[in-house]
Every structure is written in C-alpha cells, then in structure tokens.
C-alpha cells in the first residue's frame, strides 16, 4: 500500500566503522522523497535527514548516545511536493532497517602503527588509539576507551629478508617483543574484538618496515 | 530473568473507573515501550494502548481513546492504565506487555480481570 | 484499520505432523507481523517477529514465512506441548491488529 507512484525503500543497510555510521537505501529517487527515523527499543523515535532526495544517512549522532543499545531505523516515502500525502492507511510507506548494535557491529577500522622502537634486542611497537566520535563528557573517546580489554591487537612481523611471519597479541596498544640483533623487521596489526560473532577483525594495517621513518633505532 | 506483574482489576459499575498497574522486573524498563492488550472472554486478542520508553509518546485503539490513559513511572519500574467511563464492552483479562520498538510483543503479563457489570 | 484473517480457524492434527496456519492483511505491511501462541486460562508467549525471526527461548520446530499480505507459520514437528491457540498480529500501523485466532487441537 502506499501513496500513487510512491515506492517503499529496500535494501537498507547500515554502514559503520568505528562507529561512524550510516543508514543506505535504495531506490534513487523518482518524483519522492525520504525522510528516516531511529530509534532503540524504547520507540522513542527520532527524525533524521528530512525530506531528502539523498539515499543515505548520517546517524552517527544518534547511535554515539549509547553504543549499546540496539537500534532500528525506518525510511518513510513521500510524494516530492506533496509531502502530507499518505497512503491508504493513513501513514507513510516506509520500511524498517536490520537491527544494529553499535558496540557488537560496527567495523574496525584499519589500525596505524603509530611507532616503533628498538632498544637491543627488543622492540616496542606502538599503535596509534584512533579517536572514535563517541563522546564521554564532551570529549571524544578513543576506540580503547570504548572497547576497553574487549579490544586486542594482532601484530605481525617479520624479517625483512625472509617470509615466515611471527605474532603477537595485547590487549594494550604496545608490544614488546624479541628480535634478532642486527636484522631489519616490518611489522603490520590489525585490531580483533575476540568476543564478536560478526566483524571480529579490521584490515591490517599498512606495513612499516625497520630502516624507514616511523622508526627508532638505538644500539644499547 | 523478565516480570510483569498486572494488578489492580475487579468488578466496576457502567461509567465507573479503574486504574491498572504493571510492576516490571528483569530489565531496563526505560529502554523499552510497554503496552496494554485485552482478552474479552473466549474472544481474541485486541491491542488497547502503547507507550514509548521516555512516555513521550501515546498511542490508543479508538475503542478507547478519550477514556483510557496509558502512562509510565520510570523510576518505579511501573505501567499504569486509567480506565475512565466503563462499559460493559471493557469487559476483559487486560495484560500489559513489553514492545521493543513499540512493534511486537515480547513478553507478557499473566493478566488482570477487568470486569464491568450493574 | 488493516484486517488481519487467520486459517483455518481450528486444526486437529497429530503428534510429528507439520502443520502450517496462514495469515493474510488486508493491505501490504511488508515483513511487520509477529505470531503468539497462547494456552487455555494463560497469557500470550512471542513465537516470531518480523514475519520470520524466532523469538529468544523459542524451538527452533517453529518458524515464519511471508512478505506483503501472506504469511505462514509452520511448526515442522507437532510436539504435544504445541496444542493452542495461535494469533498473527500486524504492526505495520496502528491500531496494531490480531488475527481471530487459530486452535490447534490433538486429532
């Protein structure tokens, strides 16, 4: 049901990583407009992007109130210039997205190796806490402080001149481990929710190498 | 483990009034919206009112509308029904239910009696 | 209001039949119903919502089809405890409305 030449969204999709989040849709628009709705189970709906012609949504600002909740959005259709117009029920066409849970869904983003520091035969490997736009107090958290221990990472390093990769894992965002005096190393992470069912892993990271800026080298 | 809890039915006179409670247990109450469903007896079910979880929103089958009052008490984990000008049609078991994003029911109460009769 | 018709109204069937009990709306309400079931003298108990995801807690024997006007129910293998009444319920749009209602007895 729904208005004359008014079609329902399909095909909703939420976006997310570290917790930036967008609602996408389809169709394009032909001669209506959308606007979305979010709520979590409170039904406390709340409108967002109104009457666009756009076919996504930036919720962030919704779901950065309580990462935890679960939420539900709904894109209503509307006639373009007419957007009173109801269908034969008296509402709106619309369709309801998945579920999403921010803290249990939302990607990892591809981490940064911030820095790393050889000190003899050891080697500290620092990754760089991206700030999320999850606000605590009027400052923004950072993806640790979000995640807390549920957060770890998985370095990767190997030896410049050879292909057999060791690893390692914290739940801190600093490693320190053993190397052979006088090789060259190149190291890559990658964040994991262990927890998680779905998205447990971001990307790896981009591999820095030993001999190149990011790094320090001192001869103890 | 989740709890809802109806009291406050009985035996009420034509355009007499009642007020129904819900106490709930096992879960954050403010996250959810709750509502009131009634059973007339050996009939079907029929949806009587809904409220969202901040109580800023209401919403009422025409069967009642004008008569009934559905609101919440947050900090006492309680859903309430004020039931005003009775007819012998309000006649029912009334069960409050938790309704996740205001949609569908998820769990019950085991029900009041509502019972409206000269 | 969006009617809800359920059928058949009653049902005898047998313990490790599958037994499936349609639903239809008077008009489109896309994937926005749930389905109850309900024992004599007891309140309601959530089986399925939006049309096909199986309420936490309950047999994995049940489960919800259909998009639009038409829906299902089937429970693939009757268990003695499944004998009730079973109700489809739209929340599309308020008035939220039930189905009348389907009993399913022991043949």
């Known amino acids: 049901s729904g208005t004359t030449n008014t079609v329902a969204a399909y095909n909703l999709t939420w976006k997310s990583t570290n917790f930036k989040t967008i609602l996408e849709w389809e169709p394009k628009p032909v001669n209506q407009v959308y606007t979305v709705q979010i709520s979590t189970k409170s039904g406390d709906w709340k409108s967002k992007c109104f009457y666009t012609t756009d076919t996504e949504c930036d919720l962030t600002d919704e779901i950065v109130k309580d990462v935890k909740q679960t939420y539900l959005a709904r894109v209503f259709s509307y006639p373009a210039g007419n957007v009173e117009s109801t269908g034969s029920a008296g509402e709106p066409l619309y369709e309801n997205s998945p579920e999403f849970t921010p803290y249990l869904e939302t990607n990892l983003g591809q981490p940064t190796i911030q820095s790393f520091e050889q000190v003899g035969t050891k080697v500290n490997v620092t990754v760089e806490d991206e700030r999320t736009l999850v606000r605590r107090n009027n400052t923004f958290l950072s993806l640790r402080d979000v995640f807390g221990k549920d957060l770890i990472y998985t370095l990767y390093y190997w030896k410049s001149s050879s292909s057999g990769k060791k690893t390692a894992k914290t739940n801190t965002n600093e490693f320190l481990i053993d190397v052979d005096k006088g090789e060259n190393y190149c190291f890559s992470v990658q964040a994991v929710i262990p927890s998680r069912t779905v998205n447990r892993k971001s990307t790896d990271s981009p591999v820095e190498c030993m001999g190149q800026e990011k790094g320090e080298f001192r001869e103890i | 483990e989740v709890q809802l809890l109806e009291s406050g039915g009985g035996l009420v006179q034509p355009g007499g009034s009642l007020r129904l409670s819900c106490a709930a247990s096992?879960?954050?109450?403010?996250?959810?919206?709750m509502s009131w469903v009634r059973q007339a007896p050996g009939k079907g079910l029929e949806w009587v009112s809904s409220?969202?979880?901040?109580?800023?929103?209401?919403y009422y089958a025409d069967s009642v509308k004008g008569r009934f009052t559905i609101s919440r008490d947050n900090s006492k984990n309680t859903l309430f029904l004020q039931m005003n000008s009775l007819r012998a049609e309000d006649t029912a078991v009334y069960y409050c239910?938790?309704?996740?994003?205001?949609?569908?029911?998820?769990?019950w109460g085991q029900g009041t009696l509502v019972t409206v009769s000269s | 209001d969006i009617q809800m018709t359920q059928s058949p109204s009653s049902l005898s069937a047998s313990v490790g039949d599958r037994v499936t009990i349609t639903c239809r709306a008077s008009?489109?309400?896309?994937?926005?119903l749930a389905w109850y079931q309900q024992k004599p003298e007891k309140a309601p108990k959530s089986l399925i919502y939006?049309?096909?995801s199986l309420q936490s807690g309950v047999p994995s024997r049940f489960s919800g089809s259909g998009s639009g006007t038409d829906f299902t129910l089937t429970i693939s293998s009757l268990q003695p405890e499944d004998f009730a009444t079973y109700y489809c319920?739209?929340?599309?749009?308020?008035?939220?409305?039930f189905g009348q209602g389907t009993k399913l007895e022991i043949k």
């Open positions: 239910a938790k309704t996740p994003w205001g949609y569908y029911f998820d769990y």
């Open positions: 096992g879960f954050t109450f403010n996250n959810y919206a």
């Open positions: 409220i969202s979880g901040s109580g800023g929103r209401t």
């Open positions: 008009q489109g309400i896309s994937s926005r």
């Open positions: 939006a049309a096909s």
């Open positions: 319920q739209q929340y599309n749009s308020y008035p939220y409305t």
